[in-house]
């Protein structure tokens, strides 16, 4: 589809005569009839196969024709066609005299013709005007013409239909030859396929609009190149979706069991030494002068009971002071002013002279201690039992009652039921107060993970069209990661083709 345009520029009829030679009265009121038809070697009368057009009276005798296209007028003259432009044509231009206002052919006398020109030739579609001038004995006509395509038609013959669009069916404008030119961010034959964010993973990502990167199940990140680990995975990573490979120092199905608390949290203060003592458990060994679970508190100097012989300790700004009982003196009440003659030994203790009677020493019976056997032995005061063990006085001796999981004279040894690796099939072992517990990986159960309870959901190759299959550990089901161009729970349907059902 296109338009043959004819621009009349100047008509000269100096003598103001008709083709018959008769003069027009009072002058030749001139209008034109145009006939456009298929190419004829010799242009002959007959149907104007490509179209006809008439002008109103444009002037008298000789005149220039004004370009009226901008004002919606009739110059250039428009001869539209709705077929492929053949590249050749025949053109007949007749100049007529209009004695009255009725310009219809049947209303004009036959001798009202002023002149007639006929041309033929080839003409390519294009924006450039061809200028021509035809002269007869009495008249001269200057004009130009061209063929252009209608809106939305392109190509050498105006045969290519192309309408720019920006919707679900395409995102493009049209090139001069009618080919589609995709808008930025779109590609494909009809510019329907968005160009995803640069770097978006080909298999794991997709997009529904340009510069987007939407991730397929099991993938995450700006470019969908990071796998999603198993739900609940705390201190682990993955190389394929739904994995949970533990970082160093962590264990368990979800890598949430802290096997190296000391390194991860540095809980011990004031230069104390930290020891890992099980999952999320640690022990701080304090430097002298510090106490508390984390050695976070200083010890009061009196806490070490520095005063001897029954002296009482008082904390002071710059340390401590011992208040000595009668008969004793010195920084720690360590010196006695008594002798055996004073019977200083209590609770049946026997007195022995020292330094020629200037001093003495008490030998205490069992269960009593102190310089004067004045203290009943409480063998638990030093809290010798480790790991929460309970200290029990048993006459002259003591014993530690250990919490479950600990043994040794002072409960200093940790009994690990897990040491012999009792959990089968990669199960994670947990020490409990009264035994152990196995956390089994997916597919296994039983007290020691010895029972296989499920099979690999991907073993039957349920995914089509070269899709990747992943086993979801939490539900024992599979997930198909479809390649581009396929959808469906098993990637069985090509994109754009609805599934055909037998009913």
């Amino acid at each position: 589809s296109g338009v043959f345009q004819l621009q009349l520029q100047e008509f000269i009829n100096e003598r103001g005569v008709l083709a018959s030679g008769r003069p027009c009265e009072p002058g030749c009121r001139t209008f034109f009839r145009v006939c456009l038809k298929h190419f004829q070697a010799v242009v002959s009368p007959g149907p104007c196969t490509f179209g006809t057009v008439s002008t109103p009276v444009l002037g008298t005798n000789s005149f220039a024709v004004r370009d009226d296209s901008s004002g919606g007028g009739r110059n250039p003259l428009q001869l539209p066609f709705n077929f492929t432009w053949p590249g050749t044509f025949s053109l007949i231009i007749e100049a007529w005299h209009a004695p009255g206002d009725d310009l219809r052919p049947e209303a004009l006398p036959p001798d009202a013709l002023i002149s007639k020109i006929a041309i033929q030739g080839s003409l390519a579609v294009g924006q450039n005007w061809l200028l021509d001038e035809q002269t007869s004995t009495l008249t001269r006509l200057r004009y130009s013409y061209r063929v252009i395509c209608s809106d939305n038609y392109y190509g050498d013959n105006c045969s290519r239909l192309c309408k720019k669009r920006n919707d679900h069916f395409g995102h493009y404008v049209c090139q001069p030859d009618g080919n589609l030119s995709c808008l930025p961010g779109w590609t494909g034959e009809y510019c329907q396929q968005p160009i995803c964010l640069s770097g978006c993973h080909e298999q794991n990502g997709y997009c529904s609009k340009p510069a987007e990167c939407l991730c397929r199940p099991g993938w995450q990140g700006r470019l969908c190149n990071e796998c999603i680990p198993h739900n609940g995975c705390r201190h682990g990573t993955c190389s394929t979706p739904w994995q949970c490979t533990c970082d160093e120092g962590w264990g368990g199905l979800f890598c949430d069991q802290d096997l190296n608390y000391c390194t991860h949290h540095s809980p011990c203060k004031n230069g104390a030494t930290c020891s890992n003592s099980g999952q999320r458990s640690y022990t701080c060994t304090c430097r002298p002068g510090y106490t508390g679970v984390d050695c976070e508190l200083e010890l009061s100097e009196c806490d070490s009971n520095p005063c001897r012989n029954g002296g009482s300790c008082k904390d002071q700004e710059d340390g401590y002071h011992c208040l000595c009982p009668p008969g004793y003196y010195g920084l720690h009440c360590e010196h006695s002013t008594l002798s055996c003659a004073d019977s200083p030994c209590f609770n049946g203790g026997s007195c022995r002279e020292r330094n020629q009677g200037a001093n003495y020493a008490c030998e205490c019976p069992p269960n009593f201690t102190g310089s004067n056997c004045e203290k009943k032995v409480d063998r638990c005061t030093s809290n010798p039992c480790a790991n929460g063990g309970q200290c029990l006085n048993r006459g002259p001796s003591r014993m530690c009652r250990c919490r479950p999981g600990f043994t040794g004279t002072y409960c200093e040894l940790h009994v690990s039921d897990c040491a012999r690796n009792p959990c089968a099939h990669g199960g994670t072992c947990h020490d409990l107060e009264n035994g152990l517990m196995c956390t089994c990986p997916a597919g296994f159960s039983g007290r020691r993970c010895e029972v296989r309870t499920s099979i690999d959901a991907c073993a039957s190759s349920p995914c089509f069209n070269r899709a990747t299959c992943y086993t979801d550990l939490s539900t024992d089901t599979f997930v198909c990661n479809c390649p581009y161009g396929f959808v469906g729970s098993r990637c069985e349907f090509p994109v754009g083709l609805p599934p055909s059902f037998p009913w």
């Epitope: 949290h265 999320r280 458990s281 508190l297 200083e298 904390d315 002071q316 929460g388």
Partner: antibody
Amino acid sequence: QVQLQESGPGLVKPSQTLSLTCTVSGGSINSVTYYWTWIRQHPGRGLEWIGYIKFSGSTYYNPSLKGRVTISVDTSKNQFSLKINSVTAADTAVFYCARASGSHTFDIWGQGTMVTVSS
Amino acid sequence: ETTLTQSPGTLSLSPGERATLSCRASQSVSNSYLAWYQQKPGQAPRLLISGASSRVTGIPDRFSGSGSGTDFTLTISRLEPEDFGMYYCQQYSRSPITFGQGTKLEIK
């Protein structure tokens, strides 16, 4: 925000064991940072620090009460508890549970519960 | 243990006045590990100052703490009606953690 709530009997007979529980809401008792602490206030008197427990179950007690006091934790219930055995009238007090940060400043307290030791 | 002695036992002042509360330790408090608390009748104590001088988030700037070693001070620059109640100091450098016997701040 984290809140603490003490619970337990308001009256205990002499020589028996006083038992209180502190429930932590709005946060996890499993946090590495905190010392979960018991403090008491005798009627009309000052405050006395009893001791603390950490998430791991490790405890530390005021030496003046050691031997009579046990603090335990139940992480599954987000609770920690206090037991004082062989109580006397001198143990009558308002008991508070509190959260201490890495240094022992008590930024969050329960509203307190009055325990009377009387026959 | 480290004994904390607070003075005065009772302080009677009017709103708008300046209050100065003292806390003296029986032995030096390392790292200025001293805190101040406010307690109203029937309520739990509320932490005001830690580290001798660091005001806790949400505490008005009329409260300030100072001191080191054995002598510490809590100052309330301009008393508001809601500031009256008991004030306790606490040391947390040494075992056992101890509190002062308290200063009662009452309306004159």
